[in-house]
Amino acid sequence: AWELTILHTNDVHSRLEQTSEDSSKCVNASRCMGGVARLFTKVQQIRRAEPNVLLLDAGDQYQGTIWFTVYKGAEVAHFMNALRYDAMALGNHEFDNGVEGLIEPLLKEAKFPILSANIKAKGPLASQISGLYLPYKVLPVGDEVVGIVGYTSKETPFLSNPGTNLVFEDEITALQPEVDKLKTLNVNKIIALGHSGFEMDKLIAQKVRGVDVVVGGHSNTFLYTGNPPSKEVPAGKYPFIVTSDDGRKVPVVQAYAFGKYLGYLKIEFDERGNVISSHGNPILLNSSIPEDPSIKADINKWRIKLDNYSTQELGKTIVYLDGSSQSCRFRECNMGNLICDAMINNNLRHTDEMFWNHVSMCILNGGGIRSPIDERNNGTITWENLAAVLPFGGTFDLVQLKGSTLKKAFEHSVHRYGQSTGEFLQVGGIHVVYDLSRKPGDRVVKLDVLCTKCRVPSYDPLKMDEVYKVILPNFLANGGDGFQMIKDELLRHDSGDQDINVVSTYISKMKVIYPAVEGRIKFSTGSH
């Protein structure tokens, strides 16, 4: 028998520095977790203690903090190289800055293979990107070899910016021939490493013949055997065992997100490459594990540029950006319009000739807007200004909801109107009319939404049974501000980009902004 230790991370999302327990900015260092310096300490400890160790990442290193905003992926390559990762799968967020934003900072700089079997390049990109990412890689581990085959969510064109010269194939269809190829090369220990979410991970384990282990990401799934060490509630045991169609027991693992845990899986193979046993658990990277001093020093050196960045001008406003609670919790406010416009702009994806865009709607709780920006300061907008507007460190996510759920959400928006409460919705791609003389739960008298399957966008009445895509804060997707109906009824939820980053990118792109109050939210009385 031969034993392999798989160490794995996924959905680190730019958390290079240690964070608080909820993966936001570290405030009390004695209670902070994760970060590459602490991760390195634990990885090195395991490498010294065990003979056959692989360190793998299942994608979405990109996007999530000011580190990515400033360094644009160079930080990922630098610190993953320093930690000596053995392989990484491409996640959807690796395409957030387009293909160029993946090639230059990461693919060309990484000293480890970057993998995806279901992404196929075409046209002029094919030769440019050739060899920079691979469908699979055979890695020598001790006296043996292990095949790693990669995969990426086929939803990536809807979630990021891969452009028109990359085709995202069905994961299972693309993986099978690559695994077969590995088998013909006499590689009998194969790990599928990828970024399509837990449900797809399980399907791959079930359907792809020859895959021995699946190491996944995208769904931020926390698996644990026994009493979990922090607040994450396990979705199942670690490893999660799937019985494949050909009768094998295939372990599937994921390690939550944000570098809070290091996945730790021990696999025992027989001489024919069959999995005899698998066991382990994610390791909570808490403050009992010291930060490696050399990596920490490097982090501090790279940090200097971040502190300078937060006071630099991103763009200008020539109008007052009204983010006051008197406005944003009572009526349409132009800060809400700006943020929603930025959210939609960040999700522009021309993936189908029938659709001008895959999503046209945004909702945003007024209580999430925490500051105005005064245009009389030379019009300057900085990251620091935006951090006061959006101080809670959330993401702007993509969800799919039925029209009936949206209607409930808009009723909730005004169910106790007038008390300066945070649930009053700011919108984009939506025209809503409220009649406050009616009883709570029956105040929405008109709700029109911007079409997506059209060449000239126009507003049509919301259909109760239709499924709509909506961009919203993760806070709302998780039922915050009383939006329990969204949490309970959403049909799909993909985590998006850091809120401040979305708005800062938009302002940088527009250079000069002048959002208006333009009749997205109206109030009427009596007959409509």
Partner: antibody, heavy 116, light 105 residues
Framework: VQLVESGGGLVQPGGSLRLSCAAS????????MHWVRQAPGKGLEWVAV????????YYADSVKGRFTISRDNSKNALYLQMNSLRAEDTAVYYC??????????WGQGTLVTVSS | IQMTQSPSSLSASVGDRVTITCRAS??????LAWYQQKPGKAPKLLIY???TLQSGVPSRFSGSGSGTDFTLTISSLQPEDFATYYC????????FGQGTRLEIK
């Protein structure tokens, strides 16, 4: 994150006292702030709240007209002006942030004793 | 809006599963939080939005309910869990329940 209350002490019925709460380690100006009190051996009682930029204030019926909440965002400070104090106002007074996207923060409290 | 907690006190042993309930005098959606308080200490937030576990709180604590009826459950009592528990609504001007004192049996 730290919230430190001060200004408590012994005061006679009908007297006044001004409590302060000094905040550090978070963006104070982004949070609604509350005062909550707890009489000796009793449960928690909410007293007052002020919105993050100071435009809205709400009070418990038991203190309305006697207590005034205020804040100075430039100093990261929250205040509670207590007038016409009564014996039943004797309590430990806590300042606390709203429950926002990341939960809330509380101070350790300051004791106010109203007695002749 | 008044909040009524039950029981007002309860005795239990380490390892027990414990449930505390809170009833609102009218519907409050999911605007409910649960706090733990130990003698001489400030309250500590356990659950907000009825069911969201606060960062740093062990997963043996869970919250459920919506509308008027809410529950705090401790799946397996640990020695450090003996304390007083309060529910609080934030649907209207905030109001706490009267508290539930959890004692060692």
């Amino acid at each position: 994150v730290q919230l430190v209350e001060s200004g408590g002490g012994l005061v006679q019925p009908g007297g006044s006292l001004r409590l302060s709460c000094a905040a550090s380690g978070f963006t104070f100006s982004s949070y609604d702030m509350h005062w909550v009190r707890q009489a000796p051996g009793k449960g928690l009682e909410w007293v007052a709240v002020m919105s993050y930029e100071g435009s809205n204030k709400y009070y418990a019926d038991s203190v309305k007209g006697r207590f005034t909440i205020s804040r100075d965002n430039s100093k990261n400070a929250l205040y509670l002006q207590m007038n016409s104090l009564r014996a039943e106002d004797t309590a430990v007074y806590y300042c606390a942030t709203e429950i926002a996207a990341k939960g809330d923060y509380w101070g350790q409290g300051t004791l106010v004793t109203v007695s002749s | 809006i008044q909040m009524t907690q039950s029981p007002s006190s309860l005795s239990a042993s380490v390892g027990d599963r414990v449930t505390i309930t809170c009833r609102a005098s009218q519907g409050i959606s999911n605007y409910l939080a649960w706090y733990q308080q130990k003698p001489g200490k400030a309250p500590k937030l356990l659950i907000y939005a009825a069911s969201t576990l606060q960062s740093g709180v062990p997963s043996r604590f869970s919250g459920s309910g919506s509308g008027t009826d809410f529950t705090l459950t401790i799946s397996s009592l640990q020695p450090e869990d003996f304390a007083t528990y309060y529910c609080q609504q934030s649907y209207s001007t905030p109001h706490f329940g009267q508290g539930t004192r959890l004692e060692i049996k």
